[in-house]
């Protein structure tokens, strides 16, 4: 008994395709060894036709493939454009020779079945409409017209010109003539179902003078397309159901025993298991749409189907497309935190992994929104301006070569809670989903800046201090000036570093930054933060207002800006931080349903890239004490 298993008999007809799945025992050796498909000769020799090593025989060129699914312990042989010459005995097997583990498969390819003369073959997918054409002679122009379906020797009427319709074809079948045509009538059958398949006879007239035509209707089930994805990666289901359902609600469902449970539809329904990691994006006016799911889990593996119906639910006799999704647990995508917790007024540093081979790719961070079909507007990117409402509190630090970038969001409020996506314009599999949970703060923040009323005077010296607790003693402290393309590190002076860690005085741990002399362009947001190497930690932000010595010109009260930092980050308090409209990154949230479009994301944005290890920002006059 062979441990390899597969179909013993496969039968099809000329011109068709077959997809033969062979199952092997789940061992590491089996997963990685050569897989083959060979044809058994009369001499006992089995000639390789295709193998996983890349071999492809001449007779299979351009019409066959072999795909290994190690996670599923299967491999699939696809053979298209079958001919009767393909009939024979085959083996699917494993091993370096064709004598290893194998399973015998018999393939029989028949001629296209012979039908009565003048039989027209109609091949349609489930849910589609067929139009059967029935020709007749002039003598039967005024006679009764009908279409019947052969059941054994009998032929049961489906529809006729006396307005009779078989109950199982009610509202689906119509008989009509086109224009002035006097020699053809037509029968439309819509919302095709598998049991509609069979031989039909259309007839005009009665008795021996009747005109008859034969029609063979094949109704094809959707053959699931196999999708093989890594754990924690993303998958896009591209659904093209045709123009006839362009105006109907669309859905993606997952097959579950007797039902197909809707995961998302265009009427606003969404499965909670996919909250924060799914987007449905219309592609065009012809009914095409795509569904993107990120953060794939083991339990996401299974059969999926997309369809269209006014109810937004699966309905028999409506067009569908099918997929089988495999989720490979041997993933190249690192396991990162799926939930990040923060407190109001505090900050979070979110590490976003990306394909290390694509360090020059553009990085983005977007906020998943549940409204309608889900969308993910970009908040920040390496070439995208920070979105309004996030100025001064959001920055992206790229760490080239490390395979990760960090997004820091500070001045947190409970409204920041929700799902965020890390994505790049490169490898589309590397899209990760993070849930941010912001709770009300119960204690003072770890980092505190003085003075809180930060107003600097042009030409003078201005020093600002950041107090940190002893737990941050060994970490690197920094000040940076926030701008639209990141937060650029400034020279600063750590006054606590001179003490030994044993005698850490909680009150005297200070890192300070001095502006000397103060310039007008020094106005803006400054961050005090801690980090260890490339790992960013807590940050706090303060707005530094800059005034003329004369104090003649009106200026916004700086305390308002820093009140915003502590209480209401979502309010826009600063006139000076509002940019001109043309500088705003106008990023289409739909970009992220399809990697082909994401590269447009930075088109309107500025060219300079954020950098976490930059020196002092341009025009900055920071100095050490």
């Amino acid at each position: 008994q062979s441990p390899i298993f597969g179909p013993q008999d496969v039968s099809s007809i000329e011109g068709n395709s077959v997809s033969i799945t062979c199952y092997y025992p789940d061992t590491s050796v089996n997963r990685h060894t050569r897989k083959y498909w060979c044809r058994q000769g009369a001499n006992g020799y089995c000639a390789t036709l295709i193998s996983s090593n890349g071999y492809l025989s001449k007779e299979y060129s351009g019409r066959a493939s072999l795909i290994n699914f190690p996670e599923n312990s299967t491999f699939v042989i696809n053979i298209a454009h079958l001919t009767q010459e393909d009939t024979g005995s085959y083996k699917c097997g494993l091993g370096t020779t064709n004598r290893g583990l194998f399973f015998d498969v018999s393939l029989e390819v028949s001629q296209v079945p012979e039908f009565p003369n003048d039989t027209h073959v109609y091949t349609k997918d489930i849910g589609r409409t067929v139009t059967i054409e029935c020709r007749f002679k002039e003598g039967n122009a005024h006679s009764k017209k009908s279409l019947c379906k052969k059941r054994g020797e009998a032929c049961e009427v489906v529809i006729d010109s006396t307005e009779y319709v078989d109950p199982s074809y009610k509202d689906r079948a119509i008989l009509f003539m086109k224009g002035t045509s006097r020699d053809i009538f037509y029968v439309n059958i819509s919302h095709l179902i598998p049991s509609d398949a069979g031989l039909y006879v259309c007839q005009a007239g009665e008795g021996p003078s009747a005109d008859k035509n034969n029609a063979d209707l094949q109704v094809l089930e959707p053959e699931p397309e196999l999708l093989y994805k890594d754990l924690r990666s993303s998958v896009t289901f591209e659904c093209d159901l045709g123009r006839e359902v362009a105006n109907d609600a669309k859905y993606l469902c997952r097959k579950n025993k007797e039902t197909c449970d809707v995961i998302i539809n265009t009427l606003g329904k969404r499965d909670p298991a996919f909250e924060g990691r799914i987007l449905l994006t219309p592609r065009d006016d012809n009914g095409r749409f795509s569904v993107l799911i990120t953060g794939l889990r083991k339990e996401d593996a299974g059969h999926y189907q997309c369809g269209a119906h006014s109810s937004g639910l699966p309905q028999e006799g409506w067009p569908v497309q099918a997929w089988q999704l495999f989720v490979n647990e041997e993933s190249t995508i690192p396991n990162s935190r799926s939930v990040v917790k923060g407190v109001t007024g505090g900050s979070v540093a979110i590490v976003c992994p990306y394909n290390p081979k694509e360090s020059s790719s553009l990085k983005y961070w977007c906020h998943w929104e549940a409204d309608e079909n889900g969308r993910c507007p970009v908040l920040v990117g390496t070439q995208a301006l920070v979105q309004e409402g996030y100025e001064g509190r959001l920055a992206l630090f790229d760490q080239p070569g490390s395979g990760a970038y960090t997004v820091i969001l500070n001045q947190l409020t409970t409204q920041d809670s929700g799902f965020y996506w890390c994505l790049t314009d490169g490898d589309s599999r590397w899209r990760t989903t993070i849930e941010l949970q912001v709770a009300e703060a119960t204690k003072k923040p770890d980092l505190e800046v003085t003075p809180q009323n930060a107003t600097a005077v042009i030409g003078e010296t201005f020093t600002i201090s950041c107090h940190y607790p002893c737990k941050f003693y060994s970490q690197e402290k920094y000040w940076c000036k926030w701008s639209n393309d990141g937060c650029h590190i400034l020279p600063s002076h750590d006054e606590g570093a001179r003490q030994s860690s044993v005698s850490c005085d909680q009150s005297s741990q200070i890192v300070s930054m001095t502006l000397n002399p103060v310039k007008k362009e020094d106005e803006g947001w400054y961050w005090c933060g801690v980090k260890e190497g490339q790992v960013y930690g807590e940050t706090t932000a303060i707005y530094v207002a800059v005034e003329e010595r004369t104090r003649g010109s009106p200026h916004i009260n700086p305390t308002d800006a820093n009140a915003r930092a502590k209480d209401a980050p979502e309010e826009e308090a600063m006139e000076s931080s509002v940019r001109e409209d043309e500088n705003k990154a106008n990023l289409d949230p739909r970009l992220f349903a399809d990697e082909r479009e994401i590269q447009n994301a930075g088109d309107q944005a500025q060219e300079n890239r954020a950098s976490g290890n930059a020196g002092s920002a341009g025009g900055q006059s920071g100095s050490s004490k």
Partner: nanobody, 129 residues
Framework: EVQLVESGGGLVQTGGSLRLSCAAS????????MGWFRQAPGKEPERDFV?????????????YYADSVKGRFTISRDNAKNTVYLQMNTLKPEDTAVYYC?????????????????WGQGTQVTVSS
């Protein structure tokens, strides 16, 4: 909802033949994977794979058999009647069991009973020696 009804079981002598039928009714049957499983006496709740049939359209069929029935049992389908058959020849006493018909939209592995969506009530086959 789809109902599957098995028939054709009975008592037969060793070496004899039986033909089991599985008729699908209810909601139009659009399943395109059908299988036969059996449960030997005292083996509850274990159901062993016997044979399966998958079709990707009306013209392409894949037939799967357990090693123990290869060459003796044949699975087939009549699309017009929404019926699947299991022709059992050269029956042996160890073939005695309740035979269940199962239907599914697809299966990842035809031998796994969990892959099937619909089940019949079963029909008893007894092979006497």
């Amino acid at each position: 909802e789809v109902q599957l009804v098995e028939s054709g079981g009975g008592l037969v002598q060793t070496g004899g033949s039986l033909r089991l039928s599985c008729a699908a009714s209810g909601r139009t049957f659009s399943s395109y994977a059908m299988g036969w499983f059996r449960q030997a006496p005292g083996k509850e709740p274990e159901r062993d794979f016997v044979a399966a049939l998958r079709w990707s359209n009306d013209r392409t069929y894949y037939k799967y058999y357990a090693d123990s029935v290869k060459g003796r049992f044949t699975i087939s389908r009549d699309n017009a009647k929404n019926t699947v058959y299991l022709q059992m020849n050269t029956l042996k006493p160890e073939d005695t069991a309740v035979y269940y018909c199962a239907g599914g939209n697809y299966f990842s592995d035809p031998r796994v009973d969990k892959e099937y969506n619909y089940w019949g009530q079963g029909t008893q086959v007894t092979v006497s020696s």
